[in-house]
C-alpha cells in the first residue's frame, strides 16, 4: 500500500491524543534507554509503511501485537484517513481472525514497540533532517 495520500495531520492528531498513550502503557516498567532504535524512516509515507509493518506483521519472538489497543487504533486511523487502505484490509482481517493468538508480552515485543515509538516520533517531525 502507498501511504502518500493519507491525511497525515489527522493521523498525527490521533497519535498525539491516544495512540502515544497506549504505546507508553504497553512499555510501562521499561526504561526508555533499554532499547536502541534500529529502525528509521525518512518521510511520512515511509514512516507509515514501517509502522504498519512493525505493528501488524508477526516477527520472530513477537507474534501478538495486532490485538493490542495501540494496534487497533493505528489500524483504525489508517483505514479512516488513508484512501483505499480499508479495502486492502478486508482479506487481511479475515485471515487474522483465523490465526488469532493469545496476547503475550515478550522482551522482543517490548523492543518492537520501542522501535514503533521512535517511528511515530519521527512521523511527527517530518521536516527534521535524517540523522
Amino acid at each position: 500500500y502507498d501511504f502518500t495520500n493519507c491525511d497525515f495531520e489527522k493521523i498525527k492528531a490521533a497519535y498525539l491524543s491516544t495512540i502515544s498513550k497506549d504505546l507508553i502503557t504497553y512499555m510501562s516498567g521499561t526504561k526508555s534507554t533499554e532499547f536502541n532504535n534500529t529502525v528509521s524512516c525518512s518521510n511520512r509515507p515511509h514512516c507509515l509503511t514501517e509502522i504498519q509493518s512493525l505493528t501488524f506483521n508477526p516477527t520472530a519472538g513477537c507474534a501478538s501485537l495486532a490485538k493490542e489497543m495501540f494496534a487497533m487504533k493505528t489500524k483504525a486511523a489508517l483505514a479512516i484517513w488513508c484512501p483505499g487502505y480499508s479495502e486492502t484490509q478486508i482479506n487481511a482481517t479475515q485471515a487474522m481472525k483465523k490465526r488469532r493468538k493469545r496476547k503475550v508480552t515478550t522482551n522482543k515485543c517490548l523492543e518492537q514497540v520501542s522501535q514503533l515509538q521512535g517511528l511515530w516520533r519521527r512521523f511527527n517531525r517530518p521536516l527534521l533532517k535524517q540523522q
Epitope: N5, M72, A79, I80, P83, G84
Partner: antibody, heavy 120, light 107 residues
Framework: QVQLVQSGPEVKKPGSSVKVSCKAS????????MHWVRQRPGQGLEWMGT????????DYNQNFKGRATITADKSTSTAYMELSSLRSEDTAVYYC?????????????WGQGTLVTVSS | EIVLTQSPGTLSLSPGERATLSCRAS??????VHWYQQKPGEAPRLLIY???QSISGIPDRFSGSGSGTDFTLTISRLESEDFAVYYC?????????FGTGTKVEIK
Amino acid sequence: QVQLVQSGPEVKKPGSSVKVSCKASGYIFTDYAMHWVRQRPGQGLEWMGTFIPLLDTSDYNQNFKGRATITADKSTSTAYMELSSLRSEDTAVYYCARMGVTHSYVMDAWGQGTLVTVSS
Amino acid sequence: EIVLTQSPGTLSLSPGERATLSCRASQHISRSVHWYQQKPGEAPRLLIYFASQSISGIPDRFSGSGSGTDFTLTISRLESEDFAVYYCQQSYSFPYTFGTGTKVEIK
C-alpha cells in the same frame, strides 16, 4: 442483535439548532464509527460526518463544517449529531449508521431515521 | 470530492427480468464501492460491499462487479420486493459520497 434507535421527529425554527441522538446496542460501541447521513425530501443521500469512538475524534463533510457537531457518550453507547443555524433546506430525514473501523469498513446497520422539519 | 454518477435514473422492468445498474466514479477508487437498497419510508439496506463482497442474509440474486471507476450491480431475476431505489457509495476517501440513485420500477 444490532440496533440503532434514533430520537423522535423535530420541528424547528430557522436559525435554531437541533440535536438528534442515536442509541446503539448489540455490539461493542468502540469497534465502530458512527456516521450521519441525511436525505432531503425526494432527494438522494448526503454524508455529513462521523464520530470514531475508538479514537475519540470526529470528521466532517466540509459542506457542514462549523454547523454540524458530532459527538458520542461512550458510557451509554449513544451518538449525537447537532446541526445549528438551521434553514429550510435542512428539512430532511437524518440517519445514523455504524461502520467498522478495524474490520468490515462499511455502513452495515442504520437507524430508523429522524425527520427534522425547519419551518417558520 | 469524488462524484458518483448512476445510470439509468429509472429502470422499468418486469418481475423475473435481469436488472443491470451502473455507477461511475469521477476518479479511480479501486474497489471501495458499496451498494444499498432503499424503499419508501425506510433506511437504506446494505446489499454488496467492496464492489463484489456479498452480505449474509442478502439473496444471491444480487451481485456486484467492477473496479477503478466503473461498477455494476446486477439483480439476476427481479422479485416484487426488489422494486426500490438503489444507491452506490464510495468509502475510498473523505468526504464519503453517494451516487445519484437508480429507481427500479415495475413496467
